[in-house]
């Protein structure tokens, strides 16, 4: 039975084989089924000790829950057993493999993934609420600059239709708990809420149940105060690059600041041998302001296209505001194409990174 | 602006692979899905897959799982898309698309047209 | 796999009149679909996702609405540069599938 992406109904006590790392795979069990899942170390190495997590909690071994290495069983399974299970290296909490698993009301009927009848296929069996797209339901911090719009959404299905309601810090919420209000939007599976402040920090749970169960995802939402400061640039951008001749290159600068700020890319350069001015400011060239037409978003990436020898060097964003500057630099070095490194290497030449 | 900018055309052999790029620009890769669409001549679209460029995380349409393999280098904000054992089926337009977060394909690639003949 | 349903592969229109294509899905998609327009020769351009929301920078005279398994793109005032194929797309649950596509066209 076809259940679309990597989704299959699995029988009882099926053992099912891990995802390449970075795959998800979408598992549908039945209820009192044994779900196994197995996760066997990337490139048949060794794996170092895992640990296996349900909804980004551990899970702690029971009578029912049998944990391993490389594999999880969970016996008699249950609506409650339906989320998303991941197995990481304990140390660096790196995922080796994710799976999705929903277990739905009867009990499934042995593994037919080969079947052309897309019929069973229709959604309308009974079952526990599931998410529609488990594979987006992983961005769960989400930090704004006040007055923004905040969307949550938890899309999801099940049979009955399941019912969505919101809790923030694990208390029901409602319009009137906030200045502004919200807006539900029950059919798109989303809340909504416009001109955030600094009070509507905290966790936002959705709550989406059935009869046959209830799932749940929680989002931290962290509202960035806008207080008088020069912009602030995210760390590590734009980041050092190496091209080759002829290529295109992209720097990038993300800019936070509450007043309007004001970015250009600047390309150090020198001047009769000399990089700075006699008063020891730098000599630069203007690459790109702002426009008419130009978004801040925009202004956020500097493209260079079909580099030349002459576009290596330091490059600078440069974020004003009423209150100041920040600046962020990056190197571009550029190296000859892979031709000419073949003829120098023939004439004897050694190219230093 | 923004825009994906993908390989050009390609003739293969059947029984070969072609891996087929996708490069983004105007924006910041992580902050989008990237999907891939495949549209056989004069004939509707079909989802391929998605990739999520922040950890890699792939989702396959279940059709395509055993044919595509969807990879992504964040580091020149390019995602690929590789397939395998092609056959004269394979012949399509193959379109990368980005989504963010459950919102619809707001911006797609120009397209690459993969031919597949002896 | 949800399938999405476009009933008519032609329409044919005038500039000026109301035109609206229409689009059904085998189950209820709870509003997660998407309108697309594609020219000959062009990539699809978004238009419309979650049944009613305009994609920036489309005119108001695009607008979708439809709930459950029915939804509807309708183009209030054709012009000429409207002439094109039109594909809907649930974007609800995986796989996402599209419809066959309805080709706006002159009588």
């Known amino acids: 039975e076809s259940l679309g992406t990597e989704q299959r109904v699995v029988g009882r006590a099926a053992e099912v084989p891990g995802p390449e790392p970075g795959q998800q795979e979408q598992l549908v069990f039945g209820s009192g089924d044994a779900v196994e899942l197995s996760c066997p170390p990337p490139g048949g190495g060794p794996m170092g000790p895992t640990v296996w997590v349900k909804d980004g909690t551990g899970l702690v071994p029971s009578e029912r829950v049998l944990v391993g290495p490389q594999r999880l069983q969970v016996l008699n399974a249950s609506h409650e057993d339906s989320g998303a299970y991941s197995c990481r290296q304990r140390l660096t909490q790196r995922v080796l493999c994710h799976f999705s698993v929903r277990v739905t009301d009867a009990p499934s009927s042995g593994d037919d993934e080969d079947g052309e009848d897309e019929a069973e296929d229709t959604g309308v069996d009974t079952g526990a609420p599931y998410w529609t797209r488990p594979e987006r339901m992983d961005k769960k911090l989400l930090a704004v600059p006040a007055a923004n719009t905040v969307r949550f959404r938890c899309p999801a299905a099940g049979n009955p239709t399941p019912s969505i309601s919101w809790l923030k810090n694990g208390r029901e919420f409602r319009g009137e708990h906030r200045i502004g209000g919200i807006k539900l939007r029950h059919q798109q599976w989303s809340l909504v809420m416009e001109s955030v402040v600094p009070s509507d920090r905290g966790n936002y749970t959705c709550v989406v149940e059935n009869k046959f169960g209830s799932i749940r995802q929680t989002y931290t939402l962290d509202v960035l105060e806008r207080s008088p400061h020069r912009p602030i640039l995210q760390a590590g951008l734009p980041a050092n690059q190496t091209a080759v001749l002829g290529s295109d290159v992209e720097f990038h600068c993300k800019v936070y600041s509450d007043a309007q700020p004001h970015i250009q890319w600047l390309k150090h350069v020198e001047v009769n041998g000399s990089k700075v001015g006699p008063d020891g400011t730098p000599y630069v060239t203007v690459l790109k302001t702002a426009g008419a037409n130009t978004t801040d978003k925009e202004l956020e990436v500097l493209s260079l296209h079909n580099v030349t020898f002459e576009d290596a060097g330091e490059y600078t964003c440069l974020a004003g505001n009423s209150i100041g500057f920040s600046h962020h630099s990056a190197w571009l070095v550029v190296l000859p194409a892979e031709e000419e490194l073949v003829e120098a290497d023939e004439a004897g030449s050694v190219y230093a990174g | 602006e923004v825009q994906l900018q993908q390989s050009g055309p390609d003739l293969v052999k059947p029984g070969a692979s072609v891996k087929i790029s996708c490069k983004a620009s105007?924006?910041?890769?992580?902050?989008?899905?990237m999907n891939w669409v495949k549209q056989s001549h004069g004939k509707s679209l079909e989802w391929i897959g998605d990739i999520n460029p922040n950890n890699g995380v792939t989702t396959y349409n279940q059709k395509f799982k055993d044919k595509a393999t969807l990879t992504v280098d964040k580091s020149s904000s390019t995602a690929y898309m590789e397939l395998r054992s092609l056959t004269s089926e394979d012949s399509a337009v193959y379109y990368c698309?980005?989504?963010?977060?459950?919102?619809?394909?707001?911006?797609w690639g120009q397209g690459t047209t993969l031919t597949v003949s002896s | 796999d949800i399938v999405m349903t476009q009933s008519h592969k032609f329409m044919s229109t005038s500039v000026g009149d109301r035109v609206s294509i229409t689009c059904k899905a085998s189950?209820?998609?709870?509003?997660?679909v998407a309108w697309y327009q594609q020219k000959p020769g062009q990539s699809p351009q978004l238009l419309i996702y979650w049944a009613s929301t305009r994609h920036t920078g489309v005119p108001d005279r695009f607008t979708g609405s439809g709930s459950g398994t029915d939804y509807i793109l309708t183009i209030r005032s054709v012009q000429a540069e409207d002439l094109a194929l039109y594909y809907c797309?649930?974007?609800?649950?995986?796989?996402?599938?599209f419809g066959a596509g309805t080709k706006l066209e002159l009588k």
């Open positions: 189950q209820d998609v709870s509003t997660g």
């Open positions: 105007g924006y910041t890769v992580t902050d989008y899905y």
């Open positions: 698309a980005r989504e963010e977060d459950f919102d619809g394909f707001d911006y």
């Open positions: 797309q649930q974007h609800y649950s995986t796989p996402l599938t």
